[in-house]
């Protein structure tokens, strides 16, 4: 308050302007740009501990221009905000804040999060997952043949990752027992790992029999033709009611 | 030295146009902004709108839509219209200038016209 | 529209005392503020702008200062010539509004 003592704007007329610089329409020397040519925005700049009148194409980070008959200027965004489009919309906010709407806030309304890469409130995205994908081939120890009791596997894929604030992904491996009648290896097939083989339909007698296990195993296979008469087939029928219980575990 | 001085009747009726004019001397009114200004009796200052250099008019939105502001640049002279006028519009009207926002704001005034509104 | 609340209302001081008239915005008026000066019967009289600009002719008693929000003037040794009305105006943007007014009066 003491620099502006002794210093003082004369009355002056607008006509008065020999020596403006750029875009001013009339200018004092003390104070420099008191007016601007049309649609340019009259902004302070501070000089030191002197601020001084000049006229801007467009305002600078922090203010947005302000247009009204015949006079421009550059206007400070919210206190909160760090570049605007006007005094109720900000686009960026200042560090601490979350952008949403247009406005600058604390802490994300109800329903919302807060995104600490964009400083943006966003909506709370929950995990989605595919359908299962049909269930793999019964093996054991990796081969198709030479047992009775074996697992299969299906899996299913995450489509959407959650956010931070969003449901967890469900389980997407699901693991079974399967029991499948005893057939021997032929020859050349020992050691062949159930996707190495050929996809035929599966048999309609199959026993499958649920059992918790974490191992990803192949998917999407089919089990081989097994021949069986049918008492066979009726007494399978009544064990795969009773055995239909899954366990899942997640990957 | 710019001069400014408001004319018009001192007395209005009720539902009435108020009409004024400020007629400006010492600068020309295709300078600058030429602004009314009123105060009720015993209160503060209220804005009413301006005319530009250009003619371009801008007004208070609480009165916007009873104010009309235009002006004759062969006379030098800008008015005020206000249409509708209630005793709520009995006041001291002044005209101003300035000359932006880099200078002072009203650095001239009118000595100001009291207009009552009464039947 | 921006809000401005000026206080007090009205004081009474003695000649030679130093006044101080206070003005708030209802949000940032990024220093684009005047002080009036008003006499009864006449119109006001401009005496500060840009927060802390001293028009000409205006006595260097008088100072202004702010920032943001909060704006005020100073008289630092009030005289005889001084008791009046004094009004703030923000005009950072439209509509221009002025303070209530603060009367300045003998103790």
């Known amino acids: 308050q003491n620099a502006s003592r002794g210093r003082r704007q004369r009355r002056m007329h607008p006509n008065v302007s020999q020596g403006c610089q750029g875009g001013c329409a009339t200018c004092s020397d003390y104070n420099g740009c008191l007016s601007c040519k049309p649609r340019l925005f009259f902004a302070l700049e501070r000089i030191g501990m002197k601020q001084i009148g000049v006229c801007l194409s467009s305002c600078p980070s922090g203010y947005y221009g302000t247009r009204y008959p015949d006079i421009n200027k550059c206007t400070k965004c919210k206190a909160d905000c760090d570049t605007c489009f006007n005094k109720n919309f900000c686009t960026k906010c200042k560090s601490g804040f979350y952008l949403h709407l247009g406005k600058c806030l604390d802490n994300c309304p109800e329903g919302l999060e807060a995104n600490n890469h964009t400083m943006e409130c966003v909506s709370i995205v929950h995990c989605e997952v595919s359908e299962w994908n049909p269930w793999s081939p019964c093996t054991k120890k990796g081969k198709t043949c030479g047992f009775k009791r074996g697992t299969e596997t299906r899996v299913r894929e995450i489509i959407q990752h959650p956010s931070a604030k969003g449901n967890l992904c469900p389980p997407t491996n699901e693991t079974r027992k399967c029991t499948v009648q005893r057939k021997k290896c032929q020859k050349g097939e020992r050691g062949k790992k159930g996707r190495e083989r050929k996809r035929k339909k599966p048999n309609k007698g199959e026993s499958k029999e649920a059992i918790p296990d974490s191992k990803s195993l192949e998917s999407s296979k089919e089990i081989p033709e097994q021949r069986e008469n049918k008492q066979q087939q009726k007494k399978r029928k009544v064990q795969d009611k009773q055995k239909s219980v899954s366990v899942s575990t997640v990957h | 030295e710019v001069q400014l001085v408001e004319s018009g009747p001192g007395l209005v009726k009720p539902s009435e146009t108020l009409s004024l004019t400020c007629t400006v001397s010492?600068?020309?009114?295709?300078?600058?902004?030429w602004n009314w200004i009123r105060q009720p009796p015993g209160k503060g200052l209220e804005w009413i709108g301006y005319i530009s250099y250009s003619g371009k008019t801008y007004q208070n939105p609480s009165l916007k839509s009873r104010i009309t502001i235009s002006r004759d640049t062969s006379k030098n002279q800008f008015s005020l219209k206000l249409s509708s006028v209630t005793a709520a519009d009995t006041a001291v009207y002044y005209c101003?200038?300035?000359?932006?926002?880099?200078?002072?704001?009203?650095?001239?005034w009118g000595q100001g016209t009291l207009v009552t509104v009464s039947s | 529209d921006i809000q401005m609340t000026q206080s007090p209302s009205s004081l009474s001081a003695s000649v030679g005392d130093r006044v101080t008239i206070t003005c708030k915005a209802s949000?940032?008026?990024?220093?684009?503020l005047s002080w009036f000066q008003q006499k009864p019967g006449k119109a006001p009289k401009t005496l500060i702008y840009?927060?802390?600009r001293l028009v000409d002719g205006v006595p260097s008693r008088f100072s202004g200062s702010g920032s943001g929000t909060d704006y005020t003037l100073t008289i630092s040794s009030l005289q005889p010539e001084d008791f009046a009305t004094y009004y703030c105006?923000?005009?950072?943007?439209?509509?221009?509004?002025f303070g209530q007014g603060t009367k300045v009066e003998i103790k």
């Open positions: 105006l923000h005009y950072d943007e439209f509509p221009l509004t």
């Open positions: 101003a200038t300035y000359y932006g926002y880099g200078g002072p704001w009203f650095a001239y």
């Open positions: 840009l927060t802390n």
């Open positions: 949000q940032d008026i990024d220093s684009y």
């Open positions: 010492g600068d020309s009114i295709t300078s600058g902004y």
